[in-house]
């Protein structure tokens, strides 16, 4: 019997120092470019090799970025979010949400209090 896939969601504060070629990652998402259905959040789509984010090692492709230097990224147009990163200065603080896929036992053995669906 196949196991059910669940997700463990954690948050982390990541402080990056802008390198010679910038922060070194790509984003997708925004109110005009929803990457996840019914979610206009901003997601990391690419970590560039040898960039600041890659060298730090904590930011991962697929992470959702909740805020930049304390500024919430909710309900932003995609380009406005891009501009926010580009104008964020030398020291950049990111609040990110990691979503780790976990195998959670056989189907039909849902733990008590487990969210359905």
């Amino acid at each position: 019997m196949n196991g059910r896939v669940d997700y463990l969601v954690t948050e982390e504060e990541i402080n990056l120092t802008r390198g010679p070629s910038g922060l070194g990652f790509n984003i997708v998402g925004g109110t005009d470019q929803q990457y996840v259905s019914n979610d206009s959040g901003i997601y990391v789509s690419r970590i560039k090799e040898n960039g600041a984010a890659a060298l730090d090692g904590r930011l991962q492709e697929g992470d959702k970025i909740l805020s930049v230097n304390g500024q919430d990224l909710k309900n932003l147009l995609h380009q406005d979010a891009v501009d926010l990163f580009r104008n964020a200065g030398y020291a950049v603080s990111l609040r990110v949400q990691h979503r780790l896929q976990v195998q959670n036992g056989p189907i039909g053995h849902r733990g008590e209090g487990d969210p359905s669906g």
Epitope: G22, F25, V28, Y35, Y43, R46, G62, V82
Partner: nanobody, 128 residues
């Protein structure tokens, strides 16, 4: 990590057609820019065609325009290269490549158009 597996290569006569496929796994396909590259005998690896993550922007090498078509099927996690009117000079190992799409948070000058992060093993195409 992204795993890429190409298929569809083979031996074909000049003027014939082949359809290459590249199946991707390891992360959501819908956020990936995809590309096809080729390495001809004794030559550097060249970009042949690319398609961005949303599917609304494509690029073709001049010598394949009008003959080759790149497309993607996000439901099947697959990118295709339809090759028509093949010529002997199309003989090469064809590689599928992928990278995360979207916008760089850095200045646009930093974008390297044909820099890809993940590569398949390649499939041989021989046109006789």
């Amino acid at each position: 990590q992204v795993q890429l597996v190409e298929s569809g290569g083979g031996l074909v006569q000049a003027g014939g057609s082949l359809r290459l496929s590249c199946a991707a796994s390891g992360r959501p396909f819908s956020s990936l820019d995809m590309g096809w590259f080729r390495q001809r005998p004794g030559k550097e690896r060249d970009v042949v065609a690319t398609i961005n993550w949303t599917g609304d922007s494509t690029y073709y090498l001049d010598s394949v325009k009008g003959r080759f078509t790149i497309s993607r099927d996000n439901a099947k996690n697959t990118v295709f290269l339809q090759m028509n009117s093949l010529k002997p000079e199309d003989t090469a190992v064809y590689y599928c490549a992928a990278r995360g799409g979207g916008s760089s948070v850095d200045s646009e000058y930093d974008v390297r158009e044909f820099e890809y992060d993940y590569w398949g093993q390649g499939t041989q195409v021989t046109v006789s």
